[in-house]
């Protein structure tokens, strides 16, 4: 018996608008109906929780109103989008999946997605 497997892309480049999207896929050992997904960021030996959502299978993924994350779920796959990113937010973003109900509880952690964020160059002043 091993930890639940969670897959996510190794690298993602955020858009010029500071938006990064990636898929978090988990191999569910059972028929979970309630799943909790948490995005963690590891950088400079610090770990912070970026966002978290609990959802019922087949229902929409709902983050808190002030969350920088949005997402959708489809089967054992979660499509995550993080917005408002700046260069200083570059780091390893880890997908943590917990199968909350029904028992037994399972925990899986992905190997992390390195998100690179490059601040856009300011537009040069125009003479026109």
């Amino acid at each position: 018996c091993k930890a639940m497997h969670v897959a996510q892309p190794a690298v993602v480049l955020a858009s010029s608008r500071g938006i990064a999207s990636f898929v978090c896929e988990y191999a569910s050992p059972g028929k979970a109906t309630e799943v909790r997904v948490t995005v963690l960021r590891q950088a400079d030996s610090q770990v912070t929780e970026v966002c978290a959502a609990t959802y019922m299978m087949g229902n929409e993924l709902t983050f808190l109103d002030d969350s920088i994350c949005t997402g959708t779920s489809s089967g054992n796959q979660v499509n995550l989008t993080i917005q408002g990113l700046r260069a200083m937010d570059t780091g390893l973003y880890i997908c943590k999946v917990e199968l909350m109900y029904p028992p037994p509880y399972y925990l899986g952690i992905g190997n992390g997605t390195q998100i690179y964020v490059i601040d856009p160059e300011p537009c040069p002043d125009s003479d026109f």
Epitope: M4, L40, S45, K96, L107, I109, N111
Partner: nanobody, 127 residues
Framework: EVQLVESGGGLVQPGGSLRLSCAAS????????IGWFRQAPGKERETVAC??????SYADSVKGRFTISRDNSKNTVYLQMNSLRAEDTAVYYC??????????????????????WTQGTQVTVSS
């Protein structure tokens, strides 16, 4: 699936010792980091120590006093607590995290990575 059960809490005088045990069933401990955490009344849950196959890590407040070890044959992790102080009084929890290649000595004990939390055992240090 992993199931953890901890034991060994109790009342001890300052300067005394206690040993906590965290026994796993349903899985071998091998692919997991096992951590000990504690929570005092009105405070956040904090890291005490953790151990994987090859490394251990401790909170600064317990270094030199507490020792974490694992016995794979018994599928059990131990926390030997010596020179106990009043400030060590708390509910102690055992938890597990899948061991990951990106864990560092500084992050492998971070509570965000853990699950399979036990109910907790009370440790009280008082004369």
């Amino acid at each position: 699936e992993v199931q953890l059960v901890e034991s060994g809490g109790g009342l001890v005088q300052p300067g005394g010792s206690l040993r906590l045990s965290c026994a796993a069933s349903g899985s071998t401990l091998d692919p997991f980091v096992i951590g000990w955490f504690r929570q005092a009344p009105g405070k956040e849950r904090e890291t005490v120590a953790c151990i994987n196959r090859s490394r251990t890590s401790y909170a600064d407040s317990v270094k030199g006093r507490f020792t974490i070890s694992r016995d794979n044959s018994k599928n059990t992790v131990y926390l030997q607590m010596n020179s106990l102080r009043a400030e060590d009084t708390a509910v102690y929890y055992c938890a597990a995290s899948p061991d990951k290649p990106f864990y560092t000595d500084q992050t492998m004990c971070n509570k965000h990575y853990y699950g399979y939390w036990t109910q907790g055992t009370q440790v009280t240090v008082s004369s």
